[in-house]
Interface confidence: low
């Protein structure tokens, strides 16, 4: 099941309990928790800009901040995918592009970022208060999702610093994310705890105002984007979405698929039975949507007598049922 | 965009056979797991088969095993259903469809326009 | 086989009001990944089906906000907030969990 996931803003224990101890002494042990706590959680920042230019045109960009590798992201509109929003763009770092009206234009910006315009014209251009969600699966974190609007008070051509915006999701957080060297610290400040725990408290008064130990991240977000983390799901203002996008296209259906070239010549092998994966061959690992790893082909057990269709461990259409990509 | 164009209606005689085409465009077959629906008049949709991943092959539904082959044509794009020892009750619009929303699994969201076949002695 | 069951069989509706059309299937559709496998697929007179819904909430791409599917396990419903007259039409839901995919038996929606 969906967890949420929110990065605690850690806080030194209270003055005065467990033998209180003077701030500078504690400076290492909450670094290093810091570092336990927040290791392997990463963190999805999303941007939302209106274009000088253009006043209906909008441009998302959203990263991802951690160390797994990409498989795959999902932009969407009017909330989280798979939560009432509508799907915009997905991009795939082998498979391409593909995107939907009112999305022109999708691309990779770096390795771990993306960006989307869209254009606004009719019934499907998107609006201020519309809501934007960027969702990123990763190998070893899992799924994390997060979403962002237009500030309210922008003018064109500005926009909100790139933020963990309100929904910051983890299916899997940071499934083997700590590093020995990081478990070693773990294990350590443990020891100086311990050490602590076992030592009589000082008789000096501690600072009432001992600093917070900072995010040991080089990419901590700034005090505004860390207050952002604690929001839960954002109340999403759906009033400016279109009412409906088949004034785009009256048949309804993908009609705005766009695509770039694909690589897959062949027919990779994928998971389940009438599942798919983006993956090339078996053996490799893949991204999950809700919580679960497996390996390529790697079939989930019968469920009666039929096969275990697209309910591949690694989630929904990391294997695609009778119906998708091979 | 993606479409799925499939060959004409057909009239067949009890006992004969049947192949239906489904020209894809916008998207390349093999990258696709094609699926094969039917409905005959006034009933329901009824899946028949499609393509495994897992195994590089086509499954078929019990009830038409030994009776339909699915087969694929990469070079052109096309997917073909074939239907043997046609029966009355196989008179129905005969669909291909397949998802390529997104890289997870959403649906079935594309599909042909719908070949009648016709079994009348 | 899943055998899926929908109620009822036929809904007559008014443009403007709500509509709500229920699915059951016999078993569950909740996958362990949280997933529930569940579409649902409108398919209007002489047209081919198309996809609403996928994954028991997922609203498909071009599909319009009016429509929303909840439910898990068994008990899936799809609604309409407000029926538009272009909503008519036969309405199905059908399991992606096993092979093979099975629908219900479809509801039919017109307008009164």
């Known amino acids: 099941m969906r967890t949420e996931a929110q990065v605690p803003a850690l806080q030194p224990p209270e003055p005065g309990l467990e033998g209180a101890m003077g701030h500078r002494t504690l400076v290492l042990p909450w670094v290093l928790l810091t570092l336990c706590v927040t290791a392997g959680t990463p963190e999805v920042w999303v941007q939302v800009r209106m274009e000088a230019t253009e006043l209906s045109s909008f441009t998302i960009r959203c990263g991802f901040l951690g160390s797994g590798s990409i498989s795959l992201v999902t932009v969407s509109w009017g909330g989280p995918n798979g939560a009432g929003g509508t799907t915009l763009a997905v991009l795939h770092p082998e498979r391409g592009i593909r995107q939907w009206a009112p999305a022109r234009q999708a691309r990779w910006e770096t390795q771990s970022s993306i960006s989307l315009i869209l254009e606004g014209s009719g019934a499907s251009s998107p609006c201020a208060n519309t809501t934007f969600c960027c969702k990123f699966a990763s190998f070893p974190e899992g799924s994390w999702e997060a979403c962002g609007s237009l500030p309210p008070s922008s003018d064109p051509g500005l926009s909100a610093p790139p933020t963990p915006a309100p929904i910051l999701r983890a299916d899997l957080a940071g499934i083997l994310g700590v590093s020995g060297v990081l478990l070693f610290g773990c294990v350590y400040l443990l020891h100086l705890l311990r050490r602590h725990k076992h030592r009589p408290a000082p008789r000096l008064q501690p600072s009432r105002t001992s600093p917070q130990a900072p995010r040991a991240r080089a990419w901590a977000p700034s005090q505004a984007s860390q207050a952002a983390l604690h929001v839960p799901y954002a109340t999403i203002n759906t009033s400016c979405r279109p009412a409906t996008l088949d004034t785009a296209h009256p048949h309804g259906g993908p009609s705005w698929w766009a695509s770039l070239p694909t690589h897959a010549a062949h027919r990779p092998q994928g998971p389940a039975a009438w599942a798919s994966t983006p993956i090339p061959a078996r053996g490799s690992f893949v991204s999950v949507e809700n919580g679960l790893y497996a390996q390529a082909g790697e079939r989930p057990p019968h469920t009666g007598p039929g096969l275990t269709l697209f309910p591949d461990p690694r989630g929904p259409r990391a294997m695609e049922g009778p119906l998708g990509v091979r | 965009e993606v479409q799925l164009v499939q060959s004409g209606a057909e009239v067949k005689k009890p006992g004969a056979s049947v192949k239906v085409s489904c020209k894809v465009s916008g998207y390349t077959l093999t990258e696709l797991s094609m699926h094969w629906v039917r409905q005959a008049p006034g009933k329901g949709l009824e899946w028949m088969g499609g393509f495994d991943p897992e195994d590089g092959e086509t499954i078929y539904a019990q009830k038409f095993q030994g009776r339909v082959t699915m087969t694929e044509d990469t070079s052109t794009d096309t997917a073909y259903m074939e239907l043997s020892s046609l029966r009355s009750e196989d008179t129905a619009v005969y669909y291909c469809a397949t998802g390529v929303t997104t890289y997870y699994y959403y649906g079935m969201d594309v599909w042909g326009q719908g070949t009648t076949v016709t079994v009348s002695s | 086989d899943v055998v899926m069951t929908q109620s009822p069989l036929s809904l007559p509706v008014t443009p403007g009001e709500p509509a709500s059309i229920s699915c059951r299937s016999s078993?569950?559709?909740?996958?362990?990944?949280?997933?529930?496998?569940l579409d649902w697929y409108l398919q209007k007179p002489g047209q081919s089906p198309r996809l609403l819904i996928s994954l028991g909430s997922n609203r498909a791409s071009g599909v319009p906000d009016r429509f929303s599917g909840s439910g898990s396990g068994t008990d899936f419903t799809l609604k309409i907030s407000r029926v538009e007259a272009e909503d008519v039409g036969i309405y199905y839901c059908m399991q992606a969990l096993q092979t093979p995919p099975t629908f219900g038996q479809g509801t039919k929606v017109e307008i009164k």
């Open positions: 078993q569950s559709l909740l996958y362990s990944n949280g997933n529930n496998f």
